[in-house]
Protein backbone atom coordinates (compact mmCIF):
# COMPACT_ATOMS: atom_id res chain seq x y z
CA UNK A 1 0.00 0.00 0.00
CA UNK A 2 1.37 3.17 -1.13
CA UNK A 3 1.04 5.97 1.79
CA UNK A 4 3.63 8.71 1.16
CA UNK A 5 2.77 12.09 -0.35
CA UNK A 6 5.13 14.21 -2.69
CA UNK A 7 5.73 17.27 -1.60
CA UNK A 8 7.02 19.77 -4.47
CA UNK A 9 7.94 23.50 -4.56
CA UNK A 10 4.91 23.59 -7.07
CA UNK A 11 4.63 26.97 -9.72
CA UNK A 12 7.27 28.90 -9.44
CA UNK A 13 8.75 31.56 -11.85
CA UNK A 14 12.20 32.37 -12.06
CA UNK A 15 13.96 35.01 -14.17
CA UNK A 16 15.70 34.54 -17.74
CA UNK A 17 19.62 33.91 -17.37
CA UNK A 18 19.12 32.80 -13.57
CA UNK A 19 18.82 30.30 -11.40
CA UNK A 20 16.08 27.94 -10.40
CA UNK A 21 16.00 24.64 -7.72
CA UNK A 22 13.81 22.32 -8.78
CA UNK A 23 12.46 20.05 -5.20
CA UNK A 24 10.82 17.63 -4.41
CA UNK A 25 10.55 15.41 -0.91
CA UNK A 26 8.86 12.34 -0.34
CA UNK A 27 6.79 12.01 3.45
CA UNK A 28 4.88 9.44 5.01
CA UNK A 29 6.71 6.63 4.08
CA UNK A 30 9.08 4.30 4.80
CA UNK A 31 10.06 3.15 1.84
CA UNK A 32 13.14 3.17 0.35
CA UNK A 33 13.94 5.63 -2.17
CA UNK A 34 16.01 3.56 -4.78
CA UNK A 35 16.16 6.53 -7.93
CA UNK A 36 14.65 9.58 -8.53
CA UNK A 37 14.35 10.38 -12.48
CA UNK A 38 13.86 14.35 -13.26
CA UNK A 39 11.87 14.72 -16.69
CA UNK A 40 10.82 17.88 -18.63
CA UNK A 41 7.68 18.81 -19.59
CA UNK A 42 8.73 16.59 -23.08
CA UNK A 43 9.62 14.45 -21.16
CA UNK A 44 12.90 13.92 -21.95
CA UNK A 45 15.26 12.82 -19.01
CA UNK A 46 16.89 15.89 -17.49
CA UNK A 47 19.06 13.74 -14.11
CA UNK A 48 18.85 10.87 -12.49
CA UNK A 49 19.84 10.69 -8.87
CA UNK A 50 20.59 6.51 -8.39
CA UNK A 51 20.88 5.43 -4.60
CA UNK A 52 23.77 3.27 -5.54
CA UNK A 53 25.74 5.22 -8.06
CA UNK A 54 24.70 9.04 -7.29
CA UNK A 55 23.80 11.60 -10.08
CA UNK A 56 23.85 11.25 -13.67
CA UNK A 57 23.40 14.33 -15.47
CA UNK A 58 21.84 13.63 -19.05
CA UNK A 59 24.37 14.92 -22.12
CA UNK A 60 21.77 17.99 -23.14
CA UNK A 61 21.88 19.49 -20.00
CA UNK A 62 25.31 18.74 -18.38
CA UNK A 63 26.26 22.39 -18.44
CA UNK A 64 23.45 24.27 -16.90
CA UNK A 65 22.21 21.45 -14.25
CA UNK A 66 23.56 21.11 -10.95
CA UNK A 67 22.53 18.28 -8.98
CA UNK A 68 21.10 19.06 -5.44
CA UNK A 69 19.80 19.92 -2.90
CA UNK A 70 19.63 16.95 -1.67
CA UNK A 71 17.51 15.21 -4.51
CA UNK A 72 16.30 18.13 -6.30
CA UNK A 73 17.89 19.91 -9.07
CA UNK A 74 19.18 23.31 -9.80
CA UNK A 75 18.85 24.59 -13.39
CA UNK A 76 21.05 27.07 -14.84
CA UNK A 77 21.08 29.49 -17.19
CA UNK A 78 17.52 29.68 -17.67
CA UNK A 79 16.13 30.28 -21.04
CA UNK A 80 12.36 30.76 -22.36
CA UNK A 81 11.91 27.75 -23.65
CA UNK A 82 12.63 26.16 -20.14
CA UNK A 83 9.23 27.62 -19.16
CA UNK A 84 6.86 24.12 -18.57
CA UNK A 85 6.46 21.04 -16.60
CA UNK A 86 8.34 19.55 -14.76
CA UNK A 87 8.45 16.22 -12.92
CA UNK A 88 10.51 14.38 -10.18
CA UNK A 89 9.33 10.40 -10.07
CA UNK A 90 10.25 8.45 -7.17
CA UNK A 91 11.06 4.98 -7.35
CA UNK A 92 10.77 3.21 -3.91
CA UNK A 93 10.69 0.08 -2.50
CA UNK A 94 8.40 -1.71 -1.47
CA UNK A 95 5.91 0.98 -2.69
CA UNK A 96 6.48 1.80 -6.08
CA UNK A 97 6.71 4.84 -7.94
CA UNK A 98 5.55 8.11 -6.57
CA UNK A 99 5.21 11.11 -8.89
CA UNK A 100 5.60 15.11 -8.46
CA UNK A 101 5.12 17.67 -10.46
CA UNK A 102 6.45 21.45 -10.78
CA UNK A 103 5.60 24.56 -13.13
CA UNK A 104 8.18 26.53 -14.11
CA UNK A 105 7.37 30.22 -16.24
CA UNK A 106 10.63 32.05 -16.88
CA UNK A 107 10.20 35.39 -16.95
CA UNK A 108 11.84 38.35 -19.06
CA UNK A 109 11.13 40.76 -16.46
CA UNK A 110 14.22 41.08 -14.33
CA UNK A 111 11.65 41.52 -10.98
CA UNK A 112 10.96 37.83 -11.47
CA UNK A 113 9.55 36.72 -8.19
CA UNK A 114 10.76 32.90 -7.06
CA UNK A 115 8.45 31.28 -4.84
CA UNK A 116 10.17 28.57 -2.57
CA UNK A 117 7.15 27.06 -0.62
CA UNK A 118 6.49 23.32 -1.19
CA UNK A 119 2.79 22.39 -2.11
CA UNK A 120 1.48 18.99 -2.38
CA UNK A 121 -0.12 18.60 -6.00
CA UNK B 1 19.78 -0.41 -34.82
CA UNK B 2 22.41 -0.41 -31.99
CA UNK B 3 25.54 -2.67 -32.14
CA UNK B 4 29.34 -3.07 -30.32
CA UNK B 5 32.12 -4.41 -32.10
CA UNK B 6 34.64 -5.45 -29.46
CA UNK B 7 38.82 -5.07 -30.92
CA UNK B 8 42.16 -5.80 -29.82
CA UNK B 9 44.95 -8.05 -29.66
CA UNK B 10 44.03 -11.59 -29.60
CA UNK B 11 47.37 -12.81 -27.52
CA UNK B 12 48.79 -11.07 -24.46
CA UNK B 13 51.71 -11.86 -22.40
CA UNK B 14 51.80 -12.15 -18.86
CA UNK B 15 52.42 -9.73 -16.33
CA UNK B 16 51.45 -7.13 -19.26
CA UNK B 17 48.15 -5.08 -19.69
CA UNK B 18 45.17 -6.43 -21.74
CA UNK B 19 43.17 -3.52 -23.81
CA UNK B 20 40.55 -3.63 -25.36
CA UNK B 21 38.06 -1.26 -27.16
CA UNK B 22 34.14 -1.53 -27.78
CA UNK B 23 32.57 0.54 -30.81
CA UNK B 24 28.91 1.26 -30.61
CA UNK B 25 27.04 2.06 -34.09
CA UNK B 26 23.46 3.09 -34.45
CA UNK B 27 23.10 4.79 -31.53
CA UNK B 28 25.13 7.72 -29.25
CA UNK B 29 26.94 6.24 -26.66
CA UNK B 30 26.01 9.23 -25.00
CA UNK B 31 22.40 8.89 -24.37
CA UNK B 32 22.51 9.40 -20.76
CA UNK B 33 20.38 6.14 -19.75
CA UNK B 34 22.30 3.50 -20.13
CA UNK B 35 26.07 2.55 -18.78
CA UNK B 36 28.53 0.22 -21.14
CA UNK B 37 30.03 -2.73 -19.83
CA UNK B 38 32.40 -5.41 -20.32
CA UNK B 39 31.89 -9.19 -19.35
CA UNK B 40 33.99 -11.84 -19.61
CA UNK B 41 33.75 -16.07 -20.57
CA UNK B 42 37.03 -17.70 -19.76
CA UNK B 43 36.65 -21.06 -21.97
CA UNK B 44 33.92 -23.64 -21.24
CA UNK B 45 33.48 -22.11 -18.33
CA UNK B 46 30.61 -18.89 -17.21
CA UNK B 47 30.24 -15.18 -17.09
CA UNK B 48 32.16 -12.87 -15.19
CA UNK B 49 31.24 -9.09 -15.19
CA UNK B 50 34.21 -6.57 -14.86
CA UNK B 51 33.10 -3.37 -14.61
CA UNK B 52 30.82 -0.68 -16.46
CA UNK B 53 31.11 3.18 -17.48
CA UNK B 54 28.88 5.69 -18.22
CA UNK B 55 29.26 8.64 -21.10
CA UNK B 56 30.68 11.09 -18.13
CA UNK B 57 32.89 8.58 -17.39
CA UNK B 58 30.88 7.61 -13.57
CA UNK B 59 32.04 3.35 -12.97
CA UNK B 60 31.06 1.07 -11.36
CA UNK B 61 33.62 -2.45 -11.09
CA UNK B 62 33.34 -5.95 -9.78
CA UNK B 63 35.44 -5.97 -6.17
CA UNK B 64 37.64 -8.91 -7.63
CA UNK B 65 38.81 -6.93 -10.60
CA UNK B 66 39.20 -3.57 -9.66
CA UNK B 67 42.36 -2.85 -8.23
CA UNK B 68 43.33 -4.30 -12.13
CA UNK B 69 40.76 -2.81 -14.26
CA UNK B 70 40.51 0.77 -16.25
CA UNK B 71 37.25 1.56 -18.29
CA UNK B 72 37.30 4.51 -20.04
CA UNK B 73 35.32 6.31 -22.33
CA UNK B 74 35.35 8.58 -25.71
CA UNK B 75 32.53 10.08 -27.17
CA UNK B 76 33.86 11.81 -29.27
CA UNK B 77 34.28 8.41 -31.29
CA UNK B 78 31.67 6.64 -29.64
CA UNK B 79 34.04 4.02 -27.79
CA UNK B 80 34.95 2.86 -24.15
CA UNK B 81 37.63 0.67 -23.28
CA UNK B 82 38.90 -2.25 -21.10
CA UNK B 83 42.53 -2.15 -19.75
CA UNK B 84 43.42 -4.97 -17.40
CA UNK B 85 46.81 -4.51 -15.84
CA UNK B 86 49.32 -7.34 -14.98
CA UNK B 87 47.64 -10.60 -16.86
CA UNK B 88 47.91 -13.99 -16.01
CA UNK B 89 46.78 -17.57 -17.40
CA UNK B 90 43.68 -16.90 -15.89
CA UNK B 91 42.34 -14.07 -17.84
CA UNK B 92 42.26 -15.81 -20.61
CA UNK B 93 38.67 -15.69 -21.83
CA UNK B 94 36.33 -14.38 -24.80
CA UNK B 95 35.44 -10.34 -23.83
CA UNK B 96 32.49 -9.04 -24.27
CA UNK B 97 31.17 -5.44 -24.62
CA UNK B 98 27.25 -4.54 -23.63
CA UNK B 99 24.71 -1.81 -22.96
CA UNK B 100 24.31 -2.17 -19.60
CA UNK B 101 20.85 -1.20 -18.15
CA UNK B 102 21.44 -0.52 -14.78
CA UNK B 103 19.69 2.61 -14.68
CA UNK B 104 16.16 1.63 -15.71
CA UNK B 105 15.63 0.05 -12.65
CA UNK B 106 12.97 -3.12 -13.73
CA UNK B 107 15.01 -3.49 -17.16
CA UNK B 108 18.42 -3.78 -15.41
CA UNK B 109 20.11 -6.21 -17.80
CA UNK B 110 22.63 -6.35 -20.35
CA UNK B 111 20.06 -5.98 -23.08
CA UNK B 112 22.75 -5.79 -26.58
CA UNK B 113 26.22 -7.79 -26.70
CA UNK B 114 29.30 -7.62 -29.14
CA UNK B 115 29.87 -10.96 -30.64
CA UNK B 116 33.14 -10.95 -28.80
CA UNK B 117 36.76 -11.44 -29.08
CA UNK B 118 38.70 -14.14 -27.54
CA UNK B 119 41.93 -13.20 -25.38
CA UNK B 120 44.82 -15.77 -24.75
CA UNK B 121 47.52 -14.71 -22.32
CA UNK B 122 50.36 -16.94 -22.74
CA UNK B 123 54.45 -15.88 -23.54
CA UNK C 1 28.34 -10.82 -3.05
CA UNK C 2 25.21 -12.63 -4.42
CA UNK C 3 26.02 -16.29 -4.95
CA UNK C 4 23.39 -17.54 -7.82
CA UNK C 5 23.45 -21.68 -7.69
CA UNK C 6 21.49 -23.29 -11.08
CA UNK C 7 19.86 -26.45 -11.04
CA UNK C 8 20.24 -28.77 -12.45
CA UNK C 9 23.65 -28.39 -14.33
CA UNK C 10 22.03 -30.21 -17.15
CA UNK C 11 18.85 -30.73 -18.26
CA UNK C 12 18.56 -33.09 -20.98
CA UNK C 13 15.21 -33.11 -23.16
CA UNK C 14 13.16 -33.34 -26.52
CA UNK C 15 11.91 -31.14 -28.40
CA UNK C 16 8.44 -30.49 -27.55
CA UNK C 17 8.89 -31.12 -23.61
CA UNK C 18 8.73 -28.70 -21.15
CA UNK C 19 11.84 -27.10 -19.74
CA UNK C 20 11.97 -25.57 -15.92
CA UNK C 21 15.57 -24.48 -15.08
CA UNK C 22 16.52 -23.41 -11.30
CA UNK C 23 18.00 -19.93 -9.91
CA UNK C 24 18.92 -19.60 -6.68
CA UNK C 25 20.14 -16.59 -4.59
CA UNK C 26 22.44 -16.70 -1.71
CA UNK C 27 20.55 -13.74 -0.23
CA UNK C 28 17.12 -12.12 -1.16
CA UNK C 29 17.65 -9.92 -4.58
CA UNK C 30 14.71 -7.79 -6.19
CA UNK C 31 12.43 -9.48 -8.61
CA UNK C 32 13.72 -5.84 -11.09
CA UNK C 33 17.02 -6.98 -10.90
CA UNK C 34 17.01 -10.79 -12.33
CA UNK C 35 17.59 -11.70 -15.56
CA UNK C 36 17.75 -14.50 -17.75
CA UNK C 37 20.36 -14.90 -20.76
CA UNK C 38 20.46 -17.72 -23.43
CA UNK C 39 24.09 -18.62 -25.31
CA UNK C 40 24.37 -20.84 -27.74
CA UNK C 41 27.95 -21.98 -29.05
CA UNK C 42 30.41 -19.59 -30.38
CA UNK C 43 27.73 -17.01 -29.61
CA UNK C 44 26.95 -14.14 -27.28
CA UNK C 45 24.65 -14.25 -24.47
CA UNK C 46 21.24 -13.19 -25.85
CA UNK C 47 18.78 -11.63 -23.07
CA UNK C 48 15.63 -13.59 -22.70
CA UNK C 49 14.01 -12.42 -19.60
CA UNK C 50 14.82 -9.07 -17.24
CA UNK C 51 12.64 -7.79 -14.22
CA UNK C 52 12.46 -11.56 -13.58
CA UNK C 53 9.38 -12.14 -15.59
CA UNK C 54 9.47 -9.77 -19.20
CA UNK C 55 10.34 -11.12 -21.55
CA UNK C 56 12.56 -8.46 -24.41
CA UNK C 57 12.31 -7.34 -27.23
CA UNK C 58 11.36 -10.64 -29.82
CA UNK C 59 11.60 -13.40 -27.74
CA UNK C 60 8.97 -16.11 -27.81
CA UNK C 61 6.37 -16.33 -25.19
CA UNK C 62 7.17 -20.21 -24.72
CA UNK C 63 9.95 -18.52 -22.66
CA UNK C 64 8.57 -17.17 -19.31
CA UNK C 65 10.13 -15.91 -16.16
CA UNK C 66 8.71 -16.12 -12.63
CA UNK C 67 10.13 -15.86 -9.15
CA UNK C 68 11.09 -13.67 -6.02
CA UNK C 69 13.02 -13.18 -3.05
CA UNK C 70 15.90 -16.26 -3.52
CA UNK C 71 14.06 -18.25 -5.80
CA UNK C 72 13.90 -18.01 -10.02
CA UNK C 73 12.42 -20.35 -12.36
CA UNK C 74 13.04 -20.06 -16.35
CA UNK C 75 10.23 -22.11 -18.20
CA UNK C 76 10.74 -23.15 -21.78
CA UNK C 77 6.78 -24.77 -22.22
CA UNK C 78 7.96 -26.48 -25.65
CA UNK C 79 11.14 -26.89 -26.54
CA UNK C 80 12.01 -26.04 -29.85
CA UNK C 81 15.19 -27.43 -31.94
CA UNK C 82 16.91 -24.06 -31.61
CA UNK C 83 16.46 -23.47 -27.73
CA UNK C 84 18.89 -26.06 -26.97
CA UNK C 85 21.12 -24.09 -25.24
CA UNK C 86 23.14 -22.86 -21.92
CA UNK C 87 21.24 -20.40 -19.78
CA UNK C 88 21.97 -18.16 -16.88
CA UNK C 89 20.55 -16.08 -14.68
CA UNK C 90 21.87 -13.03 -13.36
CA UNK C 91 21.07 -10.63 -10.65
CA UNK C 92 21.78 -6.60 -11.24
CA UNK C 93 22.89 -5.05 -8.20
CA UNK C 94 25.46 -2.76 -7.50
CA UNK C 95 26.37 -3.26 -3.89
CA UNK C 96 26.52 -6.25 -3.81
CA UNK C 97 28.26 -6.57 -7.15
CA UNK C 98 26.38 -8.05 -10.24
CA UNK C 99 27.02 -12.11 -10.44
CA UNK C 100 25.64 -14.35 -13.08
CA UNK C 101 24.63 -18.00 -12.19
CA UNK C 102 26.89 -20.73 -13.57
CA UNK C 103 25.00 -21.63 -16.28
CA UNK C 104 22.07 -24.55 -17.10
CA UNK C 105 22.99 -26.35 -20.74
CA UNK C 106 19.36 -27.76 -22.28
CA UNK C 107 21.22 -30.59 -24.58
CA UNK C 108 18.94 -32.93 -26.65
CA UNK C 109 17.75 -36.35 -25.10
Known amino acids: MMTGTIETTGNISAKKGGSVILQCHLSSTMAQVTQVNWEQHDHSLLAIRNAELGWHIYPAFKDRVAPGPGLGLTLQSLTMNDTGEYFCTYHTYPDGTYRGRIFLEVLESSVAEHSARFQIP | QLQLQESGPGLVKPSETLSLTCTVS??????????WGWIRQPPGKGLEWIGSIYYSGQTYYNPSLKSRVTISVDTSKNQFSLKLSSVTAADTAVYYCARDGVLTLNKRSFDIWGQGTMVTVSS | EIVLTQSPGTLSLSPGERATLSCRASQSVSSSYLAWYQQKPGQAPRLLIYGASSRATGIPDRFSGSGSGTDFTLTISRLEPEDFAVYYCQQHTVRPPLTFGGGTKVEIK
Open chain 2, 26 to 35: GGSIASGSYY
